[in-house]
């Protein structure tokens, strides 16, 4: 089925130009002396988005990011020179790239930057209340940023600041070799993962850190780190990457005799995101790119959304996998990975696991110990040598919820919004790519709510140039999405119901949980508004069922039929442009001969070729004159988008017209034109103008001029016979909807 084959293409594909023209994107295109707008901190209370960039920290107004404040925080000449002397790139590396931006308390943020390969941190005052309008750097108080921000701007930090303590996963050295998970700030001694032990961390790249409660007792709270790292030798043949989830207890203060100032509760497990292959070999998406936690009613059990890409340079693909925290906990309570046997392979540990079980937080809940410093030596020894779990964490339903392998881009970021619709709750995913586009995807149940199907609603280009989307935040309060890249920051609404069209069917076909037909337009759906006229069908997107009683209404309020006249010359070619707004729609053409009511389906062949943009008619004949109707069919619903009247001029007329006397006085034309009716004379005069006019390149421009002149004449001579004006009647009616021959994206929003 052709329509089903189109299911994995975005229904709407909007270029940056179209996004701008329809006011669907606001962009901050960066400052000349800055870049790398990668570090986001959303503050819904103050209605601000804080963004860390190169040498700057910004505070954007969530309502409109064009309204912003900025702090300039560059490095000194000293630091810049030192960095340059170390052989680093003065523009790309020897600057202060902000990597950490966290809320420190009610009045301050904590920020850290690379400091030109000399990490540095400070506090930023933001005031008690939004109306304070304070945004200033505490330049009297700088702190060493080692173990908080990486030295190298190419590396990321996963950070989390809770109760005055900063948890960060980063590289702690100049060379970018000593990767660790740290806890700094606060009143306790800094704590980190074991150094120079590849069993703990093996060249990791940190993605994010999250606090997730384990029980109702805050003492059991854990911090989870998401990262990817090199698989340990023996774990995989050849060099491979594994996606990981790591845990540490919030109340871990290190060991007493061993693992002093090192984590004693660190454990990690592999995150699997794969699809079964034809030969029984799974295709793995191992390169974890981003993670989003969707909070549920139970704070202990958020849903984890992960974006993954393939490691292979040959096969490029992306996937989204969903994980449940109960599955994660099950793995952390399962067998530890242990190296044993003649081949020194990784096997599940079969021996006695010391008590209390390594990875358990010291608390009243699970008994016995008040502090990790009181843990028995055998627990510490075991924890040191068994940081990894044997079993991996599999995604919900054991497969990705979305895969993209047939495209020239890869996924980089994800945020998810839970939307209440007429028939239930839907998760809408906004996925950022490495080419500066955002995909809007909805998970729709097929037979059951467990068996989900992904519907790609829109693909939106949010930056002028292709650029990797490196940060995304979603404001539920503002119903806006904020996107970061090297080039700048973009803001777009989560829903733009009016772009789908002016008819119930179009609104229904969109399958956007945010939108519903309210009786007169496609608008934001609010579950609280109990109106029987609300029409919405996310599960099936079936307009025939939901809008059938409104068809008359639709015809009245729906898009008016676009009509055009096109002139073609016999034996030449002409192109009839018609492409529906929806990429899921099938285009269906009909032909109606002049003075006939009967419409026939156009058969494709050498003479008529169908393209994505429309119909190409080659070697025009007189019999091709007539009406061409372009229809869009989607989900059983058909809509007529365009009626083109084609007039074919025969070559005889044209040759006579072009063949001038030898002496070039054009007497033949005079002679020929004398036998014509007044309207014919006007028409031929206009046609000659087109042929001889050096500045009129296209039929369109010619027609435009005739149309303007015609209108002017009518204004000047009211009540007069209008001569050839009927010829251009359709043209006037459809002028706004006309497209240029060059197929630039200058069209008004198309129907369907």
């Amino acid at each position: 089925n052709y329509a089903n084959g189109k299911n994995n293409v975005p229904r709407l594909k909007l270029s940056y130009k179209e996004m701008l023209e329809s006011n669907n994107v606001i962009t901050f295109n960066g400052l000349a002396n800055s870049s790398s707008y990668h570090t986001f901190l959303l503050d819904e209370e103050r209605s601000r988005l804080y963004v860390g960039a190169k040498d700057h920290i910004f505070s954007f107004n969530l309502v409109n990011i064009k309204d912003f404040q900025k702090i300039v925080w560059p490095v000194s000449y000293t630091r810049r020179d030192e960095c340059k002397w170390a052989g680093k790139d003065i523009l790309k590396e020897c600057a202060n790239f902000i990597k950490v931006l966290e809320a420190y308390n009610q009045t301050h943020l904590y920020a850290c930057g690379t400091g030109a390969f000399h990490p540095i941190c400070t506090y930023i005052e933001v005031g008690h209340h939004p109306e304070d309008n304070i945004f200033k750097l505490q330049d009297s108080h700088f702190e060493n940023g080692r173990g908080k921000s990486p030295y190298d701007p190419k590396l990321l930090t996963a950070s989390l600041l809770i109760d005055g303590e900063l948890y960060s996963g980063t590289a702690a050295d100049f060379m970018g070799r000593d990767f660790a998970i740290f806890r700094t700030l606060g009143h306790h001694h800094p704590i980190r993962t074991e150094q120079h032990d590849s069993r703990w961390l093996n060249d990791p790249r940190f993605i994010s850190a999250h606090l997730i409660p384990e029980s109702d007792n805050p003492e059991d709270d854990k911090v989870y780190f998401f990262f990817r790292e090199n698989a340990i030798d023996g774990e995989h043949s050849g060099k491979a990457t594994h996606a990981r989830i790591g845990q540490i207890c919030k109340n871990d203060f290190g060991g007493h005799r061993s693992l002093v100032n090192k984590w004693t509760t660190f454990l990690k497990a592999r995150l699997i995101c794969s699809v079964p292959g034809p030969n029984g070999i799974d295709t793995h998406f191992d390169e974890l790119q981003d993670v989003f936690l969707m909070n549920s009613k139970d704070p202990k059990n958020p849903i984890v959304y992960g974006v993954f890409t393939t490691s292979s340079n040959i096969f490029k693909g992306s996937a989204v996998c969903m994980y449940s925290m109960s599955d994660v906990r099950r793995v952390f309570l399962g067998p530890y990975a242990h190296r044993d046997g003649p081949n020194y392979q990784w096997v599940p540990y079969q021996g006695r696991v010391p008590y209390p079980r390594p990875g358990t937080c010291p608390s009243k809940t699970f008994g016995g110990f008040d502090s990790t410093k009181d843990l028995p030596d055998d627990v510490i020894t075991f924890a040191r040598s068994h940081p990894a779990m044997y079993n991996p964490v599999f995604p919900i339903n054991n497969r990705p919820i979305m895969i993209k392998t047939d495209v020239n881009y890869q996924f980089t970021q994800i945020v998810v919004d839970r939307v209440d619709a007429e028939d239930g709750q839907y998760d809408v995913m906004f996925i950022g790519t490495d080419v500066g586009t955002v995909l809007k995807v909805v998970s729709v149940p097929k037979e059951t709510w467990h068996d989900l199907e992904e519907i790609l609603l829109e693909e939106m280009t949010v930056f002028r140039e292709p650029t990797t989307i490196s940060a995304m935040e979603l404001s539920t309060k503002q119903q806006q999405l904020y996107i970061g890249s090297t080039a700048g920051v973009a803001q777009l609404p989560l829903h733009r119901c009016d772009i789908y069209g002016k008819a119930c069917a179009e609104c229904c076909l969109a399958r956007d949980p945010y939108c519903a037909w309210d009786g007169s337009s496609c608008s934001r759906y609010f579950p609280t508004a109990k109106r029987r006229t609300r029409r919405q069908d996310i599960r099936n997107g079936d307009p025939l069922t939901h809008c059938s009683d409104l068809q008359h209404h639709d015809n009245h309020h729906g898009p008016s039929l676009e009509e055009r006249i096109i002139y073609g010359v016999e034996n030449s070619s002409t192109f009839l442009e018609c492409s529906p707004k929806s990429q899921r729609a099938l285009v269906y053409w009909q032909f109606q001969r002049r003075n006939e009511d009967r419409k026939e389906e156009i058969r494709m062949g050498d003479h008529i070729i169908r393209t994505e943009q429309g119909l190409l008619l080659r070697s025009l004949q007189k019999k091709d004159s007539g009406n061409y109707l372009c229809h869009a069919v989607e989900h059983g619903f058909m809509q007529t988008l365009l009626k083109v009247t084609l007039e074919v001029i025969d070559t005889e007329h044209l040759e006579e017209l072009l063949h001038k006397d030898d002496d070039g006085d054009g007497s033949k034309i005079k002679e020929m034109s004398s036998s014509m009716t007044p309207s014919q004379k006007v028409w031929y005069r206009d046609f000659m103008q087109l042929i001889n006019h050096p500045n009129l390149n296209t039929m369109d421009e010619f027609c435009e001029q005739v149309w303007k002149r015609d209108r002017k004449q009518r204004r000047q001579r009211p009540g007069h016979s209008q001569g050839s004006s009927n010829k251009w009647k359709h043209m006037q009616e459809s002028k706004k909807g006309r497209n240029r021959r060059t197929h630039e994206f200058e069209r008004a929003p198309r129907s369907v």
């Epitope: 000194s76 020179d81 340059k84 060379m175």
Partner: antibody, heavy 116, light 110 residues
Amino acid sequence: EVQLLESGGGLVQTGGSLRLSCAASGFTFSDYAMSWVRQAPGKGLEWVSWIYYDSGSKYYADSVKGRFTISRDNSKNTLYLQMNSLRAEDTAVYYCAKLNGDFDYWGQGTLVTVSS
Amino acid sequence: QSVLTQPPSASGTPGQRVTISCSGSSSNIGNNDVSWYQQLPGTAPKLLIYADSHRPSGVPDRFSGSKSGTSASLAISGLRSEDEADYYCGAWDSSLSGYVFGGGTKLTVL
């Protein structure tokens, strides 16, 4: 007041080794890159080596590469230069200098004489 | 042979203005900051000018630095007898990945 005090110089045979030290005070030592610069008797200044504030990176002049090793101990506020396979042309006053985009503070120097 | 070229000597009478030149290439002076160092007889060098033309605190404003293209110069106005010293220019050399000094200029106050 910034102070840099070199020690460890002296007379050594060709092919021998020597370890120079530089004790720093009056500034946050662990925050700055440090360097060694030498001056042969009656000659001009020659940069020898420099080390990043956290020892993360070390750089050497071609004339000493592979023979000299720069290091530092931030807990002791001390900079070191381990000199091996010494040659007659290494004879010079060795200055320890604080790096601040240039050499903004210098020690008084320690004389190293390599005799054949 | 030094990478940066300075005249071996310069002289002037008290109160006079003296200029010492330093020429290099695009890999050092052309693209990096120039510093000037003063070395009084029997003492360690002292930073006189940094970042082409800036004076550290404590250095009299009689000393000024400038740079044009791949050349730099140090000007001393109102010359005094205590200015008699060796003067070195220095800059980072990107192609050598090292710091380079001029051969030094011995300034004599007549």
